[in-house]
């Protein structure tokens, strides 16, 4: 049994780090493998993560970490029984993938303005709470070419757009994702999408 693709890990900078790797053949990850992780700190002990299958030869492990501080550094040991398959290290603050925003809502009753709001995925005491910016993706269910991205570079989790920038009488979907420049994070996963029917009064044309 060998590791084909070494573990790579990302942290949500809150409570979970996720490590993924590939073995050289079909593996029952939960029965055959264990990922041990230990904070580099004199008084720490190793914690065990039981991996799950992620495709035939792929494994994924969710490491519980309460929370993260920037100095944290972990040693990682991947074991198959008594055999050490791989040894590495992981600094969560250098590999951050934020949690996805939630509760995306489209408010269509504000004159001819669309107001999109969503929830920050972090509690106020988490460092990332005040450092997230967002990208909102809006697309038409009828027209694949009608696909747009709005960058929200301010902290407030909301976006206002004129309903008239979209076509009237058709259905649209929206989703949102987040990232934090301070830790040069990757983008979060997209939030679940929400759907609405776009309709607005065409401005009266005078001839």
């Amino acid at each position: 049994m060998k590791v084909l693709q070494e573990p790579t890990c990302v942290s949500d900078y809150m409570s979970i780090s996720t490590c993924e790797w590939k073995m050289n053949g079909p593996t029952n990850c939960s029965t055959e493998l264990r990922l041990l992780y230990q904070l580099v700190f004199l008084l720490s002990e190793a914690h065990t993560c039981i991996p799950e299958n992620n495709g035939g030869a792929g494994c994924v492990c969710h490491l519980l970490m309460d929370d993260v501080v920037s100095a944290d550094n972990y040693t990682l040991d991947l074991w198959a029984g008594q055999q050490l398959l791989w040894k590495g290290s992981f600094k969560p603050s250098e590999h951050v993938k934020p949690r996805a925003p939630g509760n995306l809502t489209v408010h269509t009753n504000v004159s001819d303005t669309l107001l999109l709001t969503w929830s920050n995925p972090y509690p106020p005491d988490n460092y990332l709470y005040n450092h997230l910016t967002y990208a909102v993706n809006i697309w038409s269910e009828n027209d694949p070419a009608d696909f747009r991205i709005y960058n929200v570079t301010y902290l407030e989790p909301s976006l206002r757009i004129a309903a008239s920038t979209l076509k009237s009488g058709i259905s649209y979907r929206a989703r949102v994702r987040a990232w934090a420049q301070c830790y040069n994070t990757t983008w979060s996963e997209w939030s679940p999408s929400t759907k609405w029917h776009n309709s607005y009064r065409e401005p009266f044309e005078q001839h």
């Epitope: 008084l43 002990e45 970490m65 501080v69 100095a71």
Partner: antibody, heavy 121, light 106 residues
Amino acid sequence: EVHLLESGGGFIQPGGSLRLSCAASGFTFSTYAMNWVRLAPGKGLEWVSTISGSGGFTSYTDSVQGRFTISRDNSKNKLYLQINNLTAEDTAVYYCAKDRRIVGATGFDYWGQGALVTVSS
Amino acid sequence: DIQMTQSPSSLSASAGDRVTITCRASQSISSYLNWYQQKPGKAPKLLIYAASSLQSGVPSRFSGSGSGTDFTLTISSLQPEDSATYYCQQSYGFHTFGQGTRLEIK
């Protein structure tokens, strides 16, 4: 709500022994390292000992090494400190304290009310 | 062993004052530095962990900074209830405490 309650303190003669206990509730006891810290009269806080969540790892400050033994019973949510060969310098209020994080290294977020140990002839 | 040195050992200040307590480690401890408040007859209370993170429920007038060997606890606007002894603690190695700073309100 997290609660830590020490017991077993008292008045003891030099050279004597006693066992301090700390009853824990309100959190998953077995996943957190636990600690003993003491405050001697007119002195500052002194870390005494740490035990890992599983009980497999223990550590002590130099002045108590070989005389003090930390242990835990995860089935009873209890932490212990066995103190042997007591000296006057061991007179202090002894606190049990919970690690803030499962992985450690960010201090102690919950403390008991303390147990007074007085060593005197 | 890592030694922690706090200064000053005591200070007196008035309500509303900005107060700073410093802590120096004998070697680099990264940001593994915590601050506690202890009042007579009471258990210590965690104020700041990891040098600058405010523990839940602690008033925002308390803040911490620093990394490596030099750290600071700041109380931005002193309140009467802040009269206490303050301790720094490193948790990079064995959990050494500083000797404490006794803060008195004038």
